[in-house]
């Protein structure tokens, strides 16, 4: 931006200027050009010999300006177009300044001004221009300062030149209020800081509902002496519940919100939000839809899932396998997870209490993402109620549960471990195992053999322990080998059905299972 | 010295035509603006036409726009002025007159021009 | 166009006197003014152009001033050669137009 301090041209002939010598020299004319009337002071003493005359501006107002810039508009005639070469003729003349802190009027004296330079023509006018008026003009401009004092003077020597002076404009540079990246810089002089920097740092302040971003810079911008903002550094954002619009933070339109100062626009609310008022934030959940802590705000509102699908429980002796589907409504979200519990009743006394300590599953029971878990180590002859919890990330945030829950009957023991504890080639010793709350219950124990193959006869064998030796058996021969446990009320779950094989007559002490 | 030198005129019926000549000499004729200068018996002087120094642009006063017509021939160092359409008004002393920028010590040239150098007349009566 | 009136049209003086003839212009046409003498059957002769500009070869009791639309051709100390009639000429615009003369006369 450019303040004029002075226009000459813009006066239209209305200023007037000083000259020196009075009467004599520099003069005002008005011509026509472009058929508009225009003004100018011209000399043009070109056979009069040595020249020394001045024209001096009016007293000139500095204001806010430190360095002013002459920018001259004129035109110089050829000398070679005078009869002669007009032998005392010159193409140029001199620009000079003075400061001071009074208008002297017209008290004129030239060692008070201080020459700035010799102003030479880019083009001279030759005869042909002339006639033909075609006005050469030259445009030259000049940079003075620093100033000091209130005002100063402008002065022009001619020196025998025949010089028109079409336009005088003096201005100083202003670096424009500007408005970038939201935020609002003040109008500045322009003004070198020192000859090294030669660029003015100004802090901006953000536009109304925009803040500098957390931990960002605030907005800085470089005023040149050009009167150029350069160099934009940090910036503003619009805040919460607004949007950039063209240089503007604008509120976000009702059914839209924003949560955070940031570059993005405002969003529309999700799905299961209630429509928002202008310049909302967030978007509140519709009654029965919540959101989780870590959900983000542009996320819909979700609620708790229904309940598991088709939960079955296959009894396998003293083992149940629970098994189910997901919820038919999971509620908008994916991170449903699983929580088995389980409540064993004795059958007598109807008495029921949890069995968590009791039992084992597979997997921890309280985040499960499969939908299946098997328990092992039931006690038989017990009653067990198995409930599987579907939750999501909003379950916390209702008191309500969605669970569905299955029953099963345990009669039986578990079945034993069975392993080969030694064999030869006539014998096998084989050992089981049960768990120690089961043990109690069991009266004797049956061992089934027979040989692999055959299966029209088969071998039994009691005992109470927990071991037994099967002799008289072929060499190099597999036998299957099945543990059952025998209990009061009658057959126990029996073990699943094992491989065992005797040793060659040649073979050797090596046990192959 | 500069010497312009008018002929050409006389006595002519209204309507008729007539063509003056001015001859020049002891300056650069190609270098002036030449132009046609009237004076009517007893009266003032009435600009009437000027021709640029290559032959343009030419102007003309109202009163005789459309019936006059001024040309140079810069190799035979001649201006003419043709006239038809003679009217009574037209009888007057036709001057030559010439302008030379170099004698004219301005920075900027006027929007039109004065005459530094004149022939000495020729005379055109229109009578019947 | 432009209209130039001059004052006034005829005067008598004695040779030495001061003579000052007017010419007023019906608009401005800053200093764009020329003075011209012409004797009895001859051409006009260029004396004055730019308003105050003395062509070359007048002599320097000749002198004009002013500007816009009034200016004056003033002879300071009349001369015997210098009774003649003076015309003032405007050349601000194409039509380049002349007073109507003033005659300077011994008295």
């Known amino acids: 931006k450019e303040v004029v301090l002075l226009d000459f041209a813009a006066m239209k002939g209305e200023l007037g200027w000083l000259t020196h010598p009075y009467g004599k020299g520099w003069d005002l004319m008005q011509n026509i050009m472009d058929d508009m009337p225009i003004y100018m002071y011209s000399v043009c003493n070109v056979v009069s010999g040595d020249q020394d005359n001045w024209l001096r501006t009016n007293w000139v107002y500095r204001e806010e300006a430190e360095r002013i810039f002459i920018e001259l508009k004129f035109t110089v005639r050829d000398c070679n177009s005078f009869p002669g070469g007009a032998s005392s003729c010159k193409e140029t003349f001199n620009l000079y300044y003075a400061e001071s802190d009074v208008d002297y009027g017209t008290n004129f004296q030239k060692r008070q001004f201080t020459k700035i330079d010799t102003i030479a023509p880019d083009e001279i006018t030759v005869s042909s221009d002339f006639e033909a008026r075609n006005v050469k003009l030259n445009v030259e401009e000049r940079m003075v300062g620093p100033l000091t004092r209130k005002g100063f003077y402008l002065a022009f020597q001619d020196i025998g030149a025949c010089v028109a002076l079409l336009s005088v404009r003096v201005y100083y540079k202003k670096c424009p209020e500007m408005l970038q990246s939201l935020a609002r810089f003040p109008e500045t002089i322009a003004v070198a800081v020192s000859d090294t920097q030669p660029l003015a740092t100004v802090a901006g302040t953000c536009v109304d509902h925009a803040v500098v971003p957390y931990g960002g810079e605030g907005p800085l911008m470089h005023c040149t002496v050009d009167g150029e903002w350069l160099v934009p550094i940090g910036q503003c954002l619009c805040q919460e519940g607004y949007e950039k619009v063209e240089d503007a933070c604008r509120a976000c339109s009702p059914g839209f919100f924003k949560s955070e100062a940031s570059e993005s626009p405002c969003l529309e609310c999700p799905e299961h939000t209630l429509p928002s008022t202008e310049g909302a934030t967030s978007c509140q959940c519709e009654e029965g839809y919540f959101r989780a802590p870590e959900d983000p705000l542009s996320m819909s509102c979700t609620r708790p899932p229904s309940a598991p699908n088709y939960l079955t429980a296959i009894g396998m002796g003293a083992k149940v396998e629970l098994r189910w589907t997901a919820p038919k409504d999971t509620g908008g979200r994916q991170d449903i997870v699983y929580s088995v519990t389980c409540e064993q009743c004795w059958p007598e006394s109807g008495e029921c209490g949890p069995c968590e300590a009791s039992v084992r599953y597979s997997e921890p029971p309280h985040a499960l993402t499969r939908t299946s878990v098997t328990v092992s180590d039931l006690e038989p002859h017990m009653n067990y109620t198995f409930a599987v919890e579907a939750r999501n990330g909003v379950s916390g945030l209702v008191t309500s549960r969605s669970f569905r829950t299955a029953s099963v009957s345990i009669n039986q023991t578990e079945p034993p471990k069975v392993r080969l504890e030694d064999r030869s080639t006539t014998s096998l010793s084989v050992t089981w195992s049960i768990p120690v709350s089961q043990q109690s219950r069991v009266w004797k124990y049956e061992v089934t053999y027979r040989k692999k193959g055959d299966a029209n006869s088969y071998n039994v064998r009691r005992t109470e322990g927990f071991s037994v030796t099967l002799d008289d058996l072929a060499p190099d021969t597999t036998y299957l080998v099945q543990v059952q446990a025998l209990t009061q009320e009658g057959q126990g779950a029996g073990s699943k059905v094992h491989e065992f094989q005797t040793l060659s007559t040649e073979g050797s002490a090596n046990m192959a299972v | 010295e500069v010497q312009l030198l008018e002929s050409g005129g006389g006595l002519v019926q209204p309507g008729g035509s007539l063509r003056l000549s001015c001859a020049a000499s002891g300056f650069t004729f190609s270098h002036y603006m030449m132009a046609w200068v009237r004076q009517a018996p007893g009266k003032g002087l009435e600009w009437v036409s000027r021709?640029?120094?290559?032959?343009?642009?030419?102007h003309y006063a109202d009163s005789v726009k459309g019936r006059f017509t001024i040309s140079r021939d810069n190799s035979k160092n001649t201006l003419y002025l043709q006239m038809n359409s003679l009217r009574a008004e037209d009888t007057a002393v036709y001057y030559c007159a010439g302008y030379d920028s170099g004698y004219d010590y301005v920075a900027v040239a006027g929007p039109a021009e004065y005459f530094q150098h004149w022939g000495q007349g020729t005379l055109v009566t229109v009578s019947s | 166009d432009i209209q130039m009136t001059q004052s006034p049209s005829s005067l008598s003086a004695s040779v030495g006197d001061r003579v000052t003839i007017t010419c007023r212009a019906s608009q401005s046409i800053s200093t764009w003014l020329a003075w011209y003498q012409q004797k009895p059957g001859k051409a006009p002769k260029l004396l004055i152009y730019?308003?105050?500009n003395l062509h070359t070869g007048v002599p320097s009791r000749f002198s004009g001033s002013g500007s816009g639309t009034e200016f004056s051709l003033t002879i300071s100390g009349l001369q015997p050669d210098d009774f003649a009639t003076y015309y003032c000429?405007?050349?601000?615009?194409?039509?380049?137009?002349f007073g109507q003369g003033t005659k300077v006369e011994i008295k």
């Open positions: 730019k308003a105050s």
């Open positions: 000429q405007q050349y601000n615009a194409y039509s380049r137009t």
């Open positions: 021709i640029g120094p290559s032959g343009g642009p030419t």
